[in-house]
């Protein structure tokens, strides 16, 4: 009699992530009776796959009916394929015994499984860094299959070249995750400016996928001060004015001294912003001339976004 | 799912000439799509592909001889300034289901002559 | 850019005979190689893709191995229709950029 075959036909079979694969196996004949498994690997780890007797496979199904007489097609279909469902898959007919006793394997069928990557996430510096300093932001992206990929950094559409990529793991694996830093010079003039993350994989329609930060939320653009003071009033009152320009973030607090003691502390809100994304405040005091017999030493402090007091002080003329 | 390119003609050199390739039975919204042409007697060689969001890619050699754009419904290939050398039958093709390395869908081809 | 020399550029077989066709590319393209048959005045059709996979409805006979820069495209029993010519076709994953080889023609002994 003619012996036994377990016919596995592909080789290979490739499917994208979320999408069913078949795995296609038949027999050359319906002697002797025993029942087919599915197993993923070889040897004594094989994992089983699908068992028509017993067991509960909830994504796997028989592509013909098993229990139909003379049935020789025991292809199955894996549902919602995710890239942990790699690898190489053997069709297995069994002797009925007790045990039953393996009597052939097919040749097997290597699926792959391609898989897109996430969306990539950007993370920038814990703290806020001033201008002429250099921060690090973070791209992550994981679950793609292949691992080739390639990320690129841009800021303000111009590709950034101070970057340190990882793809993990190393070796073989079922999905991969990239982890990139890319090293950025901050400006003044970077409130506006934005950084984006780009990853491209042979699974997306041509479009890379990208994460975005805004460099408003990793820069402290530190104020100017110029206290200047207006021409004396009719009343004996002088106008001392305090400019703060080009701060951000709009965190900021104005003390005004006279001779060292407090007069006025004032918060900015709700200011108007300047095309280059920093503000401006300007704050006035009145001093009474006539209530002083010696000059008067202004001073105004200003304290912005948490970090150290800056002072600009000016001294009004008493005359005698 | 099919693609029927269209626009192919005699046409003298330096005449603008626009190929559209039709597309049924899938969303152009979904998959990159691509140009190819092929010399009478020659190989298949890569012109361009336009992305799912619309963006165009050329080869390296194009330098502007080539403008992919697209509809909801077709693509098109503008030959800016064709010369006797463009002389092809150019085809469409739609990217596999698994990603963008190879070219499972092709269109009949539509042939362009170039000549005075 | 990339370069995909294939070999031989033409061949006579009978039916029934095993034909190899190569394909070299300059650099490595990993496993992204897709070959294509052509018949006179047809349209280009996929057979494999990502170097071994065989595409949809095409007959086991076609067999694709490689990876890297070194591929192969098998027909373990050549059939009368089979006489056309072949492709291979690269995609870069860095440069996203496609590149054929030259065909092969494989004719009637």
């Known amino acids: 009699e003619e012996e036994l075959q377990v016919i596995q036909p592909e080789k290979s079979v490739s499917v994208a992530a979320g999408d069913s694969a078949t795995l296609n196996c038949t027999v050359s004949s319906l002697i002797p009776v025993g029942p087919i498994q599915w197993f993923r690997g070889a040897g004594p780890g094989r994992e089983l796959i699908y068992n028509l007797k017993e067991g509960h496979f909830p994504r796997v199904t028989a592509v013909s009916d098993p229990t139909k007489r003379n049935n020789m097609d025991f292809s199955i279909r894996i549902s919602n394929i995710t890239p942990a469902d790699a690898g190489t898959y053997y069709c297995v007919k069994f002797r009925k015994g007790s045990p039953d006793v393996e009597l052939k394997s097919g040749a097997g069928t290597e699926l792959s499984v391609r898989a897109k990557p996430s969306a990539p996430v950007v993370s920038g510096p814990a703290v806020r860094a001033t201008a002429e300093h250099t921060v690090s932001f973070t791209c992550e992206s994981h679950g793609f299959s292949p691992r080739d990929i390639t990320l690129k950094w841009f800021k303000n559409g111009n590709e950034l070249s101070d970057v340190q990529t990882n793809v993990d793991p190393a070796g073989k694996s079922v999905s991969y995750s990239i982890r990139s830093t890319a090293r950025v010079l901050l400006t003044r003039r970077d409130v506006h400016s934005q950084v984006i993350c780009e990853v491209a994989h042979v699974t997306l329609q041509g479009d890379p996928l990208r994460g975005t930060a805004n460099l408003s939320e990793a820069i402290r653009v530190p104020p100017f001060l110029e206290v200047t003071q207006q021409s004396m009033r009719a009343d004996n009152q002088v106008n001392v004015t305090c400019q703060v320009t080009k701060f951000y973030p709009q965190r900021l607090q104005l003390t005004w001294l006279e001779n060292g003691n407090v007069s006025r502390t004032e918060m900015a809100s709700a200011l108007p912003e300047n095309k280059d994304g920093t503000y401006n405040w300007t704050s006035w005091l009145l001093v009474n001339v006539s209530a002083h017999r010696d000059d008067v030493k202004l001073t105004c402090q200003v304290e912005h976004d948490g970090q150290p007091a800056v002072n600009k002080s000016f001294s009004v003329k008493v005359s005698a | 799912v099919q693609l029927v390119e269209s626009g192919g003609r005699l046409v003298q050199p330096g005449t603008p000439l626009t190929l559209s390739c039709t597309v049924s039975g899938f969303s152009l919204s979904s998959y990159v799509m691509g140009w190819f042409r092929q010399a009478p007697g020659k190989g298949l060689e890569y012109i361009g592909i336009?992305?799912?969001?619309?963006s165009p890619y050329y080869a390296s050699w194009v330098n502007g001889r080539f403008t992919i754009s697209k509809t909801s419904t077709t693509m098109d290939l503008k030959m800016n300034s064709p010369t006797t050398e463009d002389t092809a039958t150019y085809f469409c093709?739609?990217?596999?289901?698994?990603?963008?390395?190879?070219?499972?869908?092709w269109g009949p081809g539509t042939l362009v002559t170039v000549s005075s | 850019d990339i370069q995909m020399t294939q070999s031989p550029s033409s061949l006579s077989a009978s039916v029934g005979d095993r034909v190899t066709i190569t394909c070299r590319a300059s650099q490595s393209i990993n496993s992204y190689l897709a070959w294509y048959q052509q018949k006179p005045g047809k349209a280009p059709k996929l057979l494999i893709y990502?170097?071994?996979f065989l595409y949809s409805g095409v007959p086991s006979r076609f067999s694709g191995s490689g990876s890297g820069t070194d591929f192969t495209l098998t027909i373990s029993s050549l059939q009368p229709e089979d006489f056309a010519t072949y492709y291979c076709q690269s995609w870069h994953y860095i440069s996203r950029s496609y590149t054929f080889g030259q065909g092969t023609k494989v004719e009637i002994k």
């Open positions: 336009i992305s799912s969001s619309g």
């Open positions: 093709a739609r990217v596999g289901p698994l990603g963008v390395d190879y070219f499972n869908i």
């Open positions: 990502s170097a071994s």
